[in-house]
């Protein structure tokens, strides 16, 4: 059997750091047994077997001119093996940090912090930890270890399906290379970690007879289970083309009747989630959806209380009296509190 | 000789922007992450961001989240600061800084002061 | 964020004392704790990296010990180019963080 050690990588590769002392171990002789070292297609004998050092050619202060192929000889002048050299680093702890899109599962990436030069894997695990008793601040024994699963294909990213939402767990991404492993834990809530996807399916609609309204509408992105009790609120933002500033609005539900829209130009729209109770962070932007408001015909029936906004063209104070706002019901909310210089407008 | 340096400092008006550059030589650039580290006058140091060797995680300070970010070009071994939206407690001595292991800030620059007056 | 705490703010010592700094930080942060040295006008320059170990060209009157919380740094016999701000800095998490600093002026 062979003398040298088989470091994690591939077959017939030894590995050394620069600037350091490295050791080379003739694979196909018996410990201690002496041999002679050459660099490949050179004659120069770069150790003898007289060295003391047996199996062994050490290169003091390796440098990148040290890379490269070695041969190692018996004393019958017999083939022990080659070797390649190849310098690089121990790893440093990677980079990590993780995201989840829903409250059941969260995928986890890792970036190097440092490139090693060497080839490198990534083990990836977690626990689940547990707090003891209501009052407690102590945590038990984790449980686990369980394998986070990496992706195919080499990208570095694993995903823990099946997650607790009011659980705290400890990912574990250890780095490993032909000279070492290094470790970086981080904690993770899925509380804090929750991002939704963007909302889907924006659209933005005039009304008719209305120049100064748009309704917007979306739905749950497609990644969020569809259970009662963990629900998503929205914001949303709309701005005339041109104009820099936008506009924002918490809707109650998947729709949102803009009242203040500038009549006869283009706005742009678009909506944000988060979940219901504030846990995590809100979302990206979905992409701008476009509409502009109708040139505005007077609809053919009026709702009887908008006979109340008679009031001169200005807009009604902040406590104003305003119609109940219905939270998730599908039908249109054609008039609202915003209503009244846009309705004196319609009706004159 | 291994060494990074700064520069784009200067004065700005609160509000206003500012880039600045750190030149690497002497090593290996893209094998390393990069870090800013800034002083305000007569203050203590205060981690700003850091980015990792590729370029895909990034990492900032709360003081500064979403107003600065923090990019590299590996190709002229340059490390990069889009300050915007200035404030005047930016005012500080920015250093550019190489880390091993994500924190361990082993090589600065001189560093390049910014002033966040009007 | 981890919180780091350095003890005393300033001193004043004779040439050739013994001087320790103390740094304590909000949580357990292994060993993964720094020192730094800063002269006015300069940059920082790294000691001691990991808790105790000396980075290469460092005098060896410098050294530091501690894990966990609870870090000490010491200067064996302090010279006059020791005149400096003395920072600790953690790296457990990704969001490093320095103490306040420590001046330390002779006698």
């Known amino acids: 059997s062979s003398p040298c050690p088989q470091a994690w990588g591939p077959p017939g590769v030894q590995y050394g750091q620069p600037g350091r002392s490295v050791k080379l171990c003739c694979p196909g002789v018996t410990a201690g047994d002496p041999v002679s070292w050459f660099r490949d297609g050179e004659p120069k004998l770069l150790q003898g077997p007289d060295s003391g050092l047996g199996h062994e050619l050490v290169l003091a202060q390796a440098d990148s001119t040290d890379e490269g192929t070695y041969i190692c000889q018996t004393l019958d002048g017999a083939l022990g093996g080659t070797v390649t050299l190849q310098l690089g680093y121990p790893p440093a702890r990677p980079v990590v940090s993780c995201q989840a899109a829903d409250y059941e599962n969260f995928s986890c990436t890792w970036s190097p912090s440092q490139i090693s030069g060497l080839p490198t894997r990534y083990l990836t695990s977690y626990r689940k930890k547990t707090v003891l008793g209501a009052d407690s601040q102590r945590r038990s024994p984790s449980t686990g270890p369980w394998p986070c699963p990496q992706d195919p294909l080499g990208a570095a990213r694993c995903v823990v399906h099946g997650a607790e939402f009011w659980s705290q767990y400890r990912i574990n991404v250890t780095e490993v290379n032909p000279l070492g492993a290094s470790t970086r834990l981080l904690d993770v809530s899925l509380q804090s970690i929750l991002r939704p996807d963007p909302p889907q399916g924006l659209r933005v609609e005039s009304v008719p007879g209305y120049p100064r309204r748009l309704r917007a509408s979306w739905t749950y992105p497609a990644s969020w289970p569809c259970q009662p009790h963990f629900l998503l609120k929205f914001r949303l933002q709309y701005r005339p083309a041109q104009h820099p500033a936008w506009s924002t609005v918490e809707p109650a539900g998947l729709e949102e009747v803009i009242t203040d829209a500038v009549a006869g130009l283009p706005h742009a729209v678009r909506v944000s989630a988060r979940d219901f109770l504030d846990a995590g962070t809100w979302s990206t932007w979905s992409p701008e959806a476009w509409g502009t408001p109708s040139t505005g015909t007077i609809p053919k029936e009026i709702p009887a209380w908008g006979q109340l906004h008679t009031q001169p063209e200005v807009e009604p104070q902040v406590d104003s009296p305003a119609p109940p706002r219905p939270s998730l019901q599908p039908h249109p909310r054609l008039l609202d509190h915003r209503d009244s210089v846009e309705q004196v407008a319609v009706l004159a | 000789e291994v060494q990074l340096l700064e520069s784009g400092g200067g004065l700005v008006q609160p509000g206003g922007s500012l880039r600045l550059s750190c030149a690497a030589s002497?090593?290996?650039?893209?094998?390393?992450?990069m870090t800013w580290v800034r002083q305000a006058p007569g203050k203590g140091l205060e981690w700003v961001s850091s980015i990792v060797p590729s370029g895909g995680h990034t990492q900032y300070a709360d003081s500064v989240k979403g107003r600065f970010t923090i990019s590299r070009d590996n190709s002229k071994n340059t490390l990069y600061l889009q300050m915007n939206s200035l404030r005047a407690e930016d005012t500080a001595v920015y250093y550019c800084?190489?880390?091993?292991?994500?924190?361990?800030?082993?090589?600065w620059g001189r560093g390049t002061l910014v002033t966040v007056s009007s | 964020d981890i919180q780091m705490t350095q003890s005393p703010s300033s001193l004043s010592a004779s040439v050739g004392d013994r001087v320790t700094i103390t740094c304590q930080a909000s949580?357990?942060?292994?060993?993964?704790l720094n020192w730094y040295q800063q002269k006015p006008g300069k940059a920082p320059k790294l000691l001691i990296y990991?808790?105790?170990n000396l980075q290469t060209g460092v005098p060896s009157r410098f050294s530091g010990s501690g894990s966990g919380t609870d870090f000490t740094f010491t200067i064996s016999s302090l010279q006059p180019e020791d005149i400096a701000t003395y920072y600790c800095?953690?790296?457990?998490?990704?969001?490093?963080?320095f103490g306040p600093g420590t001046k330390v002026d002779i006698k």
């Open positions: 800084a190489k880390p091993h292991d994500w924190g361990l800030f082993d090589l």
């Open positions: 800095q953690q790296y457990d998490n990704l969001s490093p963080t």
């Open positions: 949580q357990d942060i292994n060993n993964y």
């Open positions: 990991d808790a105790s």
């Open positions: 002497g090593f290996t650039f893209s094998w390393y992450s």
